[in-house]
């Protein structure tokens, strides 16, 4: 699978993680930190 | 499966408002960012501006600014477009288009016709 | 505003020809350069995304390359169902289409 840094317009998509653009599936794709989970890393959990 | 169904076509006089929903089904428009697109009668397409749904966070292309409102209701999985101070030039059809979780998803395009 | 000049503005060429549709932005766009189809009526159809990438179901005859500034696009021979508008979009800072080119055939 081909990946690369999401673009500039994408800054802030993710909230508490790494956005990364996942080509061949033509999507972004949220890494999230420890703790945090969703499409956006949006929820935190215990 | 995925769907953006906008609503109808409009007709409406200069000077007037005009706002276009566009109702997400089969995905969260939280999880997305909704851009709104126009397309003048055999003209070109034209970006106008989107939302993140989630952070409530708008942005405008330069030529609308300030006669463009964009907003969306998370709890009715739908966004709107608000064009005011309409001129026979906004005739068009607008279109949502979903990015973020996929690549540029349509909606099947509204028309607005600006005439006294 | 990122600014996006494509062209030509519209073509006119015979059935087998090799068509080429160019994009310069105004500043680089990181390969983030999609292209559009657009067929009178319809809304607009993504045939390539990230440069080159082929979406799924657009024939192998369609392709795109670019870096920095400059992009292509490119219909290796041109079929009669190819007849329609294409337009460039950049989507590395927000979002601007180029101007279009209406293809036609000779």
């Known amino acids: 699978v081909s990946i690369t840094k999401c673009n500039s317009d994408m800054n802030g998509y993710c909230l508490h993680g790494q956005c990364i653009y996942l080509v061949d599936m033509s999507q972004n794709y949220c890494r999230c930190e420890v703790g945090y989970t969703g499409v956006r890393c949006e929820h935190f959990y215990l | 499966q995925d769907q953006l169904v906008q609503s109808g076509a409009e007709v409406k006089k200069p000077g007037a408002s005009v706002k276009v929903s566009c109702k997400a089904s089969g995905f969260n428009i939280k999880d997305t960012y909704i851009q709104w697109v126009r397309q003048a009668p055999g003209q070109g397409l034209e970006w106008m501006g989107r939302i993140d749904p989630l952070r409530r966070q708008t942005k405008y292309r330069e030529k609308f600014e300030g006669r463009v409102t964009i907003t969306a209701d998370t709890s009715t999985n739908t966004a709107y477009m608000e064009l005011s101070s309409l001129r026979s030039e906004d005739t068009a059809v607008y279109y949502c288009?979903?990015?973020?979780?996929?690549?540029?998803?349509w909606g099947q395009g509204t028309l607005v016709t600006v005439s006294s | 505003d990122i600014q996006m000049t494509q062209s030509p503005s519209s073509l006119s060429a015979s059935v087998g020809d090799r068509v080429t549709i160019t994009c310069k932005a105004s500043?680089?766009?990181?390969?983030?350069i999609a292209w559009y189809q657009q067929k009178p009526g319809q809304a607009p159809r993504l045939l390539i995304q990230?440069?080159?990438t082929l979406q799924p179901g657009v024939p192998s005859r369609f392709s795109g390359s670019g870096s920095g500034t400059d992009y292509t696009f490119t219909i290796s021979s041109l079929q009669p169902e190819d007849i329609a508008t294409y337009y460039c979009?950049?989507?590395?800072?927000?979002?601007?289409f180029g101007g279009g080119t209406k293809v036609e055939i000779k």
């Open positions: 500043q680089d766009i990181h390969k983030y």
């Open positions: 979009l950049q989507y590395d800072n927000l979002r601007t």
């Open positions: 288009v979903r990015s973020g979780t996929s690549f540029d998803f």
């Open positions: 990230y440069t080159s």
